[in-house]
Interface confidence: medium
């Protein structure tokens, strides 16, 4: 789509908007029970995946002047990951218990893993349209952080001096997982 100049995402505080009657929001529904194991269970940096909840989010996107013509569906990676040893029959046996006890100053968080880029069209207050290229989350993973680690926020990409885009959510859960840029 042709787009006039290089619009930067620009936002105002927005209130949630009602869901479109035809949209099916499945927010807060954990996928596959929310438990995802890595192949070996031994790559303790990123691929030990237990209790990483993947919540389905359906929301409208707004940049202040425009809102998406249809809801955006993506995953929200939520919460902390449970330590593996609390589960029965863990592949690592007793070793895992020592491993976790030695690392009590660390925690595992559910973070974005896989993403994909898609175009989304917004309708604007002056009756025109605008197209953005956005990155949506398609899978989550557990990642280990030390207590002192400053977790990198999974916010929108900063794009010059503009404020982040706002999401009109169809339900309650906030998401800061999509990255947005102009196409």
């Amino acid at each position: 789509f042709k787009n006039d100049a290089t619009e930067i995402l620009y936002s105002h505080v927005v209130k949630p908007v009602p869901a479109h009657p035809s949209s099916n929001s499945t927010l807060n529904q954990a996928r596959n029970g929310g438990r995802h194991f890595s192949n070996t269970g031994l790559d303790r940096n990123t691929r030990v995946q237990v209790g990483c909840r993947e919540l389905r989010s359906t929301k409208y996107i707004s940049d202040g002047q425009c809102t998406s013509i249809s809801p955006l569906k993506e995953l929200v990676c939520a919460g902390e990951c449970l330590p593996l040893p609390v589960l029965p029959n863990w592949i690592g046996g007793g070793y895992g218990t020592k491993y976790w006890s030695r690392r009590s100053s660390q925690e595992w968080r559910c973070v974005n893993d896989k993403t994909r880029t898609q175009r989304i069209q917004l309708q604007c207050q002056d009756g025109s349209t605008r197209t953005y290229k956005i990155t949506v989350v398609t899978a989550c993973k557990c990642k280990r952080y030390t207590r002192q680690h400053n977790e990198s926020s999974h916010n929108f990409e900063s794009m010059s001096p503009a404020k982040p885009v706002q999401h009109h959510r169809e339900r309650k859960r906030a998401s800061k997982s999509s990255k947005h840029s102009m196409s």
Epitope: N3, D4, Y10, H12, I69, D126, R130, H168
Partner: antibody, heavy 121, light 112 residues
Framework: QVQLVQSGAEVKKPGASVKVSCKAS????????MSWVRQAPGQGLEWMGW????????TYADDFKGRFVFSLDTSVSTAYLQINSLKAEDTAVYYC??????????????WGQGTLVTVSS | DVVMTQSPLSLPVTLGQPASISCRSS???????????LHWYLQKPGQSPQLLIY???NRFSGVPDRFSGSGSGTDFTLKISRVEAEDVGVYFC?????????FGGGTKVEIK
């Protein structure tokens, strides 16, 4: 070519309701938002708000929250403005309007012919 | 909301002579992306408004080149190099940088 054709003039009594229609043609209706603009007799233009024609989500300017309702019938490419509990000060010409293709901020290029709503006892 | 103030309210002009209308906004209309969303409309008697100039200085298709726009920040001007009879009507400036979209009060151009 893009056309926005509005319903005819209405005369209503205070307290009544009125529904103005705006039928769009010449483009894909659900791709472009629809704005509504009010012009009281001999006065300037007031932007009332707009409706996302795909999602049906309306946005109202502060002065038009409450009694004013934007709606759609996408099957006939028509946007509606309903005004409830009419007051004498609602007497005005109401325009539906649309912007240009893929050019945000390039002005409102397409306007309906306007619908005069007169509220009088 | 951004308040748009136009002057003069009324502008009597002579055919073939230039005319100028001013529009001032209560806050800067320059967007963080560098664009300035200031537009000019003409409403001829008994008609709907029509777009003349968009984004300060861009003429909309079919608009004669005797119309030109200029300005930045909060001060903008619409100029007609040589007024013709068909130019009579009310001219409005409008901004869409900020939400909500707002219009000026209008300037009535009439032939002397």
């Amino acid at each position: 070519q893009v056309q926005l054709v509005q319903s005819g003039a209405e005369v209503k009594k205070p307290g009544a309701s009125v529904k103005v229609s705006c039928k769009a043609s010449g483009y894909t209706f659900t791709t472009y938002g629809m704005s509504w603009v009010r012009q009281a007799p001999g006065q300037g233009l007031e932007w009332m708000g707009w409706i996302n024609t795909y999602s049906g989500v309306p946005t109202y300017a502060d002065d038009f929250k409450g009694r004013f309702v934007f709606s759609l019938d996408t099957s006939v490419s028509t946007a509606y403005l309903q005004i409830n509990s009419l007051k004498a000060e609602d007497t005005a010409v109401y325009y539906c309007a649309r912007g240009r293709e893929y050019y945000y901020g390039s002005g409102i290029a397409f306007w309906g012919q306007g619908t005069l709503v007169t509220v009088s006892s | 909301d951004v308040v748009m103030t136009q002057s003069p309210l009324s502008l009597p002009v002579t055919l073939g002579q230039p005319a100028s209308i001013s529009c001032r906004s209560s806050q800067s209309l320059e967007h963080s992306n560098g664009n300035t969303y200031l537009h000019w409309y003409l409403q001829k008697p008994g008609q709907s408004p029509q777009l003349l100039i968009y984004k300060v200085s861009n003429r909309f298709s079919g608009v004669p080149d005797r119309f030109s726009g200029s300005g930045s920040g909060t001060d903008f001007t619409l100029k007609i190099s040589r007024v013709e009879a068909e130019d009579v009507g009310v001219y409005f400036c409008s901004q869409s940088t900020h939400v909500p979209l707002t219009f000026g009060g209008g300037t009535k151009v009439e032939i002397k």
